[in-house]
């Protein structure tokens, strides 16, 4: 001799967000007479999901025709599942009671877990640029995934990084989770073309991880090296002085020529040569009229790169090296002649 049993065959089910979840429930008898109700959670705070007799539950449909004689299948289907639907669902048999139906027996419960994909990882770097040999931090964030288990890796140009820290929040149970990771990257002069990649692997992604990238070109500043040289020109009273500005990044650069400490000319880098590693070269020159000088001249090439403090390189132009010209050019004129960059 038996009394009615409520059978929920599935201890747990997992459903992808956006799909439908079928929660199975059968009873073994038509008696006691009374409705079936579905709840999420147990105890006084449980949430009514479906009531066989009354109420409007737009996302819930019954799998069987409950009006059919001797129906004992009270399985339901919940459409358009979201992470907020996760929880344990109980099929509860009530017996007719007056004035209220009386809870008779509950099924063991079916735990619904919702598989939700993580959002595309967003990688962000430091607010200010840094120079090679410095260590910079990159953060990677992804949200809204479930279940909690997730794997995050960092790469620089395909090489896996090891210096990073990752947190998944919240620590306890939640409908969905977020991951936050910070990686430390040491910059080199060759990193203009480099990329930092954050890779997130999750059960919902079926082995096809999501990636977020940051270009180190947004982060790195490679300061220029300067070289000032002089070459004679056909006119014996002129000298060509060049300032080679090499291997800098980004492009923003302003160059000033100083003659014995006095500003002679300022120009902004325009037509640049790009190196294979992504850095730039630029060259500026001056034509110096030696005959206009009685004493040696100190020429300085001063470069302000990307708003940083200026760096400079000087070159001493010895007037005594040109005795022929001394005093022969009496016509007035500028001591320095402008030259367009190459």
């Amino acid at each position: 001799e038996e009394e009615l049993q409520v059978i929920q065959p599935d201890k747990s089910i997992s459903v992808a967000a956006g799909e439908s979840a079928t929660l199975h429930c059968t009873v073994t008898s038509l008696i006691p007479v009374g409705p079936i109700q579905w709840f999420r959670g147990a105890g006084p705070g449980r949430e009514l999901i479906y009531n066989q007799k009354e109420g409007h539950f737009p996302r819930v449909t019954t799998v069987s025709d409950l009006t059919k004689r001797n129906n004992m299948d009270f399985s339901i289907r919940i459409s358009n599942i979201t992470p907020a639907d996760a929880g344990t669902y109980y099929c509860v048999k009530f017996r007719k009671g007056s004035p209220d139906h009386v809870e008779f027996k509950s099924g063991a419960g079916t735990e619904l877990s919702v598989r939700a994909k993580p959002s595309a990882p967003v990688v962000s770097g430091p607010a200010a640029r840094a120079t090679p040999q410095h260590t910079v931090s990159f953060t990677c964030e992804s949200h809204g995934f479930s279940p909690r288990d997730i794997t995050l890796k960092w790469f620089k140009n395909g090489n896996e990084l090891s210096d990073f820290q990752t947190n998944v929040d919240p620590a306890g149970d939640s409908v969905s989770y977020s991951i936050h990771s910070t990686a430390k990257v040491v910059l080199t002069r060759e990193d203009v073309h480099s990329q930092v990649i954050c890779e997130v692997a999750h059960v919902t992604l079926q082995g096809d991880p999501l990636r977020g990238t940051a270009n180190l070109s947004e982060t790195i500043r490679v300061p220029p090296t300067l070289e000032v040289t002089q070459q004679p020109v056909r006119a014996e009273n002129q000298v060509n002085v060049t300032c080679q500005v090499r291997k800098f990044y980004p492009q923003r650069l302003q160059l000033t020529w100083l003659e014995n400490g006095n500003v002679s000319r300022t120009e902004t880098a325009s037509t640049l040569t790009e190196n294979k590693d992504g850095t730039y070269n630029w060259m500026s020159w001056l034509l110096v009229n030696v005959s206009a000088h009685r004493d040696d001249v100190k020429l300085t090439c001063q470069v302000e790169h990307d708003g940083q403090p200026a760096v400079s390189k000087s070159h001493d132009l010895k007037v005594s090296a040109h005795p022929k010209e001394q005093g022969s050019n009496t016509a007035p004129g500028p001591a320095l002649a402008s030259a367009a960059p190459l």
Epitope: E1, N70, S98, P99
Partner: antibody, heavy 120, light 108 residues
Framework: QVQLQQSGPELVKPGASVKMSCKAS????????LSWVKQRTGQGLEWIGE????????YYNEKFKGKATLTADKSSNTAYIQLTSLTSEDSAVYFC?????????????WGQGTLLTVSA | ENVLTQSPEKMAVSLGQKVTMTCSAS???????LHWYQQKSGASPKPLIH???NLASGVPARFSGSGSGTSYSLTISSVEAEDAATYYC?????????FGGGTNLEIK
């Protein structure tokens, strides 16, 4: 047509047990709930409990738990009530009854009743 | 349990008279769950009215029922000799199913 045929009268001694039957015909026995109702002489009707023969499951009035046991045999379309530890209080007519339908709630069909007399 | 109290317990009326008997419930009963039976001496109960006011098959139109909540009634518009019997109300709103104590109708 639906018929419920109950077994004949019983005369039993106090402390003994008795098993009475209700044979159903004219419908699919396993699909309908059968109830048992007690009526003492000159008294009203008392619902004892019910059985669903489809899965041989029962539900009792708390007052009759431990006193009555309901069973059914699907092969013979017969329901049974067994009463134990009989006293004079158990002397009564016992009816089997069937609801009109599962969600009808009214006894559309009744057996003719079995008179149980408990006497030394 | 939901106790049903019927009144009067007994009544004697003349042929052709109108008769009304009541059934009062200790808890509210849905009108679809209140039923009436007629039982004659030595016979099993016979369904009379189901769901407060619906006549069972073969029941004469002189019988009618009404009511709601905790108060229900059965009326015979013009009593005939064959109506002598005990009348029981029964509720199906909550376990255990209960019957009233009955109203015995005697024809003078």
């Amino acid at each position: 047509q639906v018929q419920l045929q109950q077994s004949g009268p019983e005369l039993v001694k106090p402390g003994a047990s008795v098993k009475m039957s209700c044979k159903a015909s004219g419908y699919t026995f396993s699909e309908y709930v059968l109830s048992w109702v007690k009526q003492r002489t000159g008294q009203g009707l008392e619902w004892i409990g019910e059985i669903y023969p489809g899965t041989i499951t029962t539900y009792y009035n708390e007052k009759f738990k431990g006193k009555a046991t309901l069973t059914a045999d699907k092969s013979s379309n017969t329901a049974y009530i067994q009463l134990t530890s009989l006293t004079s209080e158990d002397s009564a007519v016992y009816f089997c009854g069937r609801f009109y339908d599962y969600d009808g709630g009214w006894f559309a069909y009744w057996g003719q009743g079995t008179l149980l007399t408990v006497s030394a | 349990e939901n106790v049903l109290t019927q009144s009067p317990e007994k009544m004697a009326v003349s042929l052709g008279q109108k008769v009304t008997m009541t059934c009062s419930a200790s808890s509210s009963v849905s009108s679809s769950d209140l039923h009436w039976y007629q039982q004659k001496s030595g016979a099993s109960p016979k369904p009379l009215i189901h769901g407060t006011s619906n006549l069972a098959s073969g029941v004469p139109a002189r019988f009618s029922g009404s009511g709601s909540g905790t108060s229900y009634s059965l009326t015979i518009s013009s009593v005939e000799a064959e109506d002598a019997a005990t009348y029981y109300c029964q509720q199906w709103s909550g376990y255990p199913w209960t019957f009233g104590g009955g109203t015995n109708l005697e024809i003078k």
